[in-house]
């Protein structure tokens, strides 16, 4: 099971002092959101027990494997369900803590109930403040059962759940009708997926016989040990005030584990620490009792004394849970409760035993999960013990499980089961990822998903030029950091592969799939300079440049011209794809715009240094429109147009253009040039009699300007059909242009 503990501090006089801490003993736990260890999550779960909204709770991370939740402002903030999630991948595990209000109408006699599939579970809610009304039981927030208040037995409302199945698991509550949900008794029911003493997919495997209140996990057969106990079968007690799968964690504060509730992965649930009991875990065990919630009885024999944390402390000459075994009986010594080896390794396993008569090599044997018995290849005999060494044949996955060391002498026999985990070395499922490249180096992310088992102890990156038969170069890197491969050849493809290792002999996995990474071209180093430029129109610019003369071939594929329009915040890029080019025509520019211009050499995707910039002002486009255009019929074939010059001219007008069109006509308009720009009047001749015409005009400097307003006028009647309009200009009357 995952080594994950959720601690609740139950000193409830002041909710602001209340805290929840989630502690992980897993390697690499909580390091962050990378492939090597997702973070610990600790949160209040409001899906079932909803409480009034309050200020947000504060989450504090203490190192890599601990997270604490604080900031409770009132007792109601505490009521409900809290969860901690830890572990990576398939081992991701949620630990749940259910908090009851000490002032609730109904209180649970026992919060966590772990039962086997098919058992009858009985939830008991004790009356704390009586109400003469119905009691409603809910399961995961939905209605489940109703009791009349008369149905209380000895001040308790009982909910019997016969033949429970795993889907019956969840949060149960008992509430008086019309009472606040915060006054409910909340329970957690955990239903193991198998009957008592069994585990595995078909519940065909036998549990190891967990001691001291440990619970056999229905998926992997491991004992989830109560806080304060360790070992494959929870056979060893931790020192007072310690917890965790290896007793590696210490209870905070001077009073040890007093006032703390410990929640462990299912199917264990929650309990007080070893040596403590009561709804707030503040009461020491009564004499003769020990362990989590003081649920265990010592029953020590042969002069043993009861320690409320560890159980029987045996006098010299005796051992066993109740001091019932004489030291004359052989005894397995200091056997590790769990060993880990890598697949296909051939490890040596030692098993030490003592006793009277003294065990010899042939009296110690090792039994594998499939029943195969191994005999020791050698034994080391010391005054106080014999250590037998077993050479294990090449390990396969089926060797995972409970092994047993057994000693037999004429004085009796002893055996010790221990768990062997056969781990599969990790193999990358994907190639490493290229982050950035330069001409002589590649920056690579080695973090890839993998098959097999973690944790990852080392990452090796193997690389060599593509299609090469030379030896691979290898670099050993930190799993969590990006790697820079240096001193490479420019514009060269490299085959790159990852190899992952896990701890222990034979932990190196196979190489992952290769990927091709290509170094960049050499960077172009020459800096061009702008020789000159000239405007070829309002939107056209001819640019020329030069390069310094250097020996050898030119490193470059072409030039990049950049025009920066600072007013509009726009950049225009023009690619000149010949490295021999020294001039370029830029078209489609915006007239009247102030540009900053530079040029740089490029090679592949790399840009060389830019030339010093030049500042270019394009002339504006055509002039503004003529003003106050007016048409006046003179005869049946002539109309006079008058106007005023445009304002704010950027230069001298070269000509005017008049557009003539028959009103409502479908044909193209006729354009007539007025080549004397000083004129402010012209006569359009050759028009048809009694015909309505539309006129507009514009000026030209270097380009044509904006059109004026359109005016309408009709020729006078009864004339002959004309050949077509022509114009005659004349100077305006004095002062007309003012």
């Amino acid at each position: 099971a995952v080594d994950l503990t959720l601690l609740a501090n139950l000193r409830l006089t002041d909710p602001q002092r209340f805290f929840l801490t989630c502690v992980s003993g897993e390697a690499g736990a909580g390091r962050g959101s990378d492939a090597w260890g997702p973070p610990l999550l600790l949160e209040k779960d409001d899906r079932i027990v909803r409480t009034p909204p309050g200020p947000p709770l504060r989450l504090a991370r203490n190192g890599s494997h601990q997270v604490t939740l604080r900031g409770f402002s009132k007792p109601s903030d505490l009521v409900g369900v809290f969860s901690c999630v830890g572990g990576a991948g398939a081992r991701r595990t949620r630990v749940i803590y259910v908090h009851n209000s000490p002032g609730a109408h109904l209180l649970p006699d026992k919060v966590t109930h772990t039962v086997n599939k098919g058992d009858t579970a009985v939830l008991s809610a004790r009356v704390h403040k009586e109400k003469q009304t119905d009691v409603i039981w809910k399961s995961n927030g939905s209605y489940f059962y109703t009791l009349d208040w008369h149905e209380a037995q000895d001040g308790r409302f009982l909910l019997q759940l016969p033949n429970v199945q795993p889907p019956s698991s969840g949060i149960y509550s008992a509430t008086y009708l019309e009472a606040s949900p915060l006054g409910s008794a909340f329970f957690r029911l955990i239903v193991r997926g198998c009957g008592a003493g069994r585990w595995g997919p078909g519940c065909t495997k036998e549990c190891p016989g967990c001691l001291h209140g440990g619970v056999c996990h229905d998926h992997d057969g491991e004992c989830v040990c109560p806080p304060g106990f360790t070992g494959t079968r929870c056979e060893q007690a931790c020192r007072e005030g310690r917890f965790g799968q290896s007793c590696q964690e210490q209870c905070p504060g001077i009073s040890g584990c007093r006032g703390l509730t410990f929640c462990l992965p299912d199917p264990y649930g929650c309990s007080c620490g070893s040596g403590w009991r009561g709804s707030q875990c503040q009461e020491a065990c009564a004499p003769g009792h020990f362990g989590a919630d003081c649920r265990l009885q010592c029953q020590c024999q042969n002069g043993g004394t009861c320690d409320r944390f560890s159980g029987c402390v045996c006098p010299s000459g005796w051992h066993g849970v109740h001091c019932e075994k004489s030291d004359r009986i052989p005894q397995i010594l200091n056997m590790a409760s769990e060993l880990e080896f890598n697949l296909e390794t051939m490890p040596r396993i030692n098993c030490a035993a003592a006793g009277n008569p003294f065990p010899v090599r042939g009296s110690i044997e090792l039994r594998k999960p499939d029943g195969t018995v191994l005999l020791s290849t050698k034994a080391i005999v010391e005054p106080e013990k014999t250590t037998a060494e077993f050479e294990v044949p090449r390990l396969v996955l089926a060797d995972s499980g409970f092994w047993e060391c057994r000693v037999s002498t004429s004085g009796g026999q002893d055996s010790r089961r221990f768990k062997v985990n056969v781990k599969v070395p990790p193999v990358p499922l994907a190639a490493p990822r290229l982050l950035t490249k330069q001409s002589r180096q590649l920056v690579v992310s080695p973090l890839v998903s993998f098959s097999g088992d973690g944790p990852i102890s080392t990452v090796r990156l193997h690389y060599r030029p593509q299609d090469s038969t030379m030896d691979w170069s290898t670099i050993v890197v930190d799993p969590s950091e990006n790697v820079t491969l240096m001193n490479l050849r420019p514009k060269t493809g490299y085959s790159v592969r990852v190899q992952l290792s896990r701890p222990g002999e034979g932990g190196e996995g196979a190489w992952g799939p290769p990927t091709l990474m290509t170094t960049d071209c050499p960077e172009p180093l020459l800096q061009p300079w702008l020789e000159g430029w000239h405007v070829e129109g309002t939107d056209r610019l001819r640019v020329s440049w030069s390069l310094p003369l250097v020996p050898g071939p030119l490193v470059g594929d072409g030039f990049l011209l950049r025009l920066w329009d600072g007013t509009r915040g726009q950049e225009r890029r023009e690619n000149v794809s010949s490295p021999q080019a020294r001039t370029a025509l830029l078209t489609g520019l915006t007239p009247g715009t102030h540009y900053q211009l530079d040029v740089q050499l490029y090679h592949c995707t790399l840009l060389g240094p830019a030339s010093p910039p030049a500042h270019v002002l394009l002339p504006p486009s055509g002039p503004p429109a003529p003003r106050h255009l007016h048409a006046q019929a003179l005869s049946d074939s002539e109309i006079q147009l008058t106007w005023k010059h445009p304002e704010a001219l950027p230069g001298p007008i070269s000509k005017y253009v008049v557009e003539v069109q028959v009103a409502g006509g479908a044909g193209d308009p006729l354009w007539i040039d007025v080549d004397r720009p000083e004129e402010t009047s012209t006569i359009i001749r050759g028009l048809n009699a009694s015909t309505r015409y539309l006129f507009r005009m514009r000026a030209s400097i270097q380009g044509l300007g904006d059109w004026s307003n359109t005016v309408e006028e009709s020729t006078l009647g009864n004339g002959l059909q004309a050949e077509g309009p022509v114009q005659e200009s004349r100077a305006a009357e004095e002062g007309l242009d003012q």
Epitope: Q132, T133, D134, I136, Y143, F144, Y145, T146, L147, D148, H150, E151, L177, E178
Partner: antibody
């Protein structure tokens, strides 16, 4: 799908007896309080009796107390109403209904009881 | 047993909203509990639960039906009236005392 089906109604003389049944399906019958409600022709609804899931506690309207008995058989998913000493004013459509906390969330289609000489 | 008082009839046009009131006589029913429910009954049919716990709607009931409570009076509001809303409506309240349990219905509102 929750279903409640009443049966046992009919014509009975004043002073006579009748036993109504209500067959339940589609839910865990043994977890819910059950209720009988009646409706006299052209009149409103009148609560008659309630029984708790265990069957151990029962309550009655004053108008039927001492004459009617509510019971249940959780193994058969069936609710009963034993009606004795029937009177003309007991003439009504009798509905069984499932109690959920403090509401009646599912009702049967009803069975007509007519008390007449 | 005293009943809960409702108006004998309420009318409205399609698309309009109407409100039916339900007034209790003691703190044992509407005023004292948040356990008022509303039922709809079409002629010749069984009653159907529309609202429970004053304002909660069972799944499958249109959100045009809503409930509320103020003091000793509960209310059912039907918005966007449809022809199919024409029916009898009853309020109900679960009444609990130390010695009895009962269920009280209001006088019908057409």
């Amino acid at each position: 799908e929750v279903q409640l089906l009443e049966s046992g109604g009919g014509l009975v003389q004043p002073g006579g007896s009748l036993r109504l049944s209500c067959a339940a399906s589609g839910f865990t019958f043994s977890n819910y309080p059950m209720t009988w409600v009646r409706q006299a022709p052209g009149k409103g609804l009148e609560w008659v009796s309630r029984i708790y899931p265990s069957g151990g506690y029962t309550y009655y309207a004053d108008s039927v107390k001492g004459r009617f008995t509510i019971s249940r058989d959780n193994s058969k998913n069936t609710l009963y109403l034993q009606m004795n000493s029937l009177r003309a004013e007991d003439t009504a459509v009798y509905y069984c209904a499932r109690g959920r906390i403090a509401a009646l969330d599912y009702w049967g289609q009803g069975t007509l009881v007519t008390v007449s000489s | 047993q005293s009943e809960l008082t409702q108006p004998a009839s309420v009318s409205g046009s399609p698309g309009q909203s109407i409100t039916i009131s339900c007034t209790g006589t003691s703190s044992d029913d509407v005023g004292g509990y948040n356990y008022v429910s509303w039922y709809q009954q079409h002629p010749g049919k069984a009653p159907k639960l529309l609202i429970y716990d004053v304002s909660d709607r069972p799944s499958g009931v249109s959100n045009r039906f809503s409930g509320s409570k103020s003091g000793n009076t509960a209310s059912l509001t039907i918005s966007g009236l449809l022809a199919e809303d024409e029916a009898d409506y009853y309020c109900g309240s679960y009444r609990v005392t130390s010695v009895s349990r009962s269920y009280v219905f209001g006088t019908e509102t057409k």
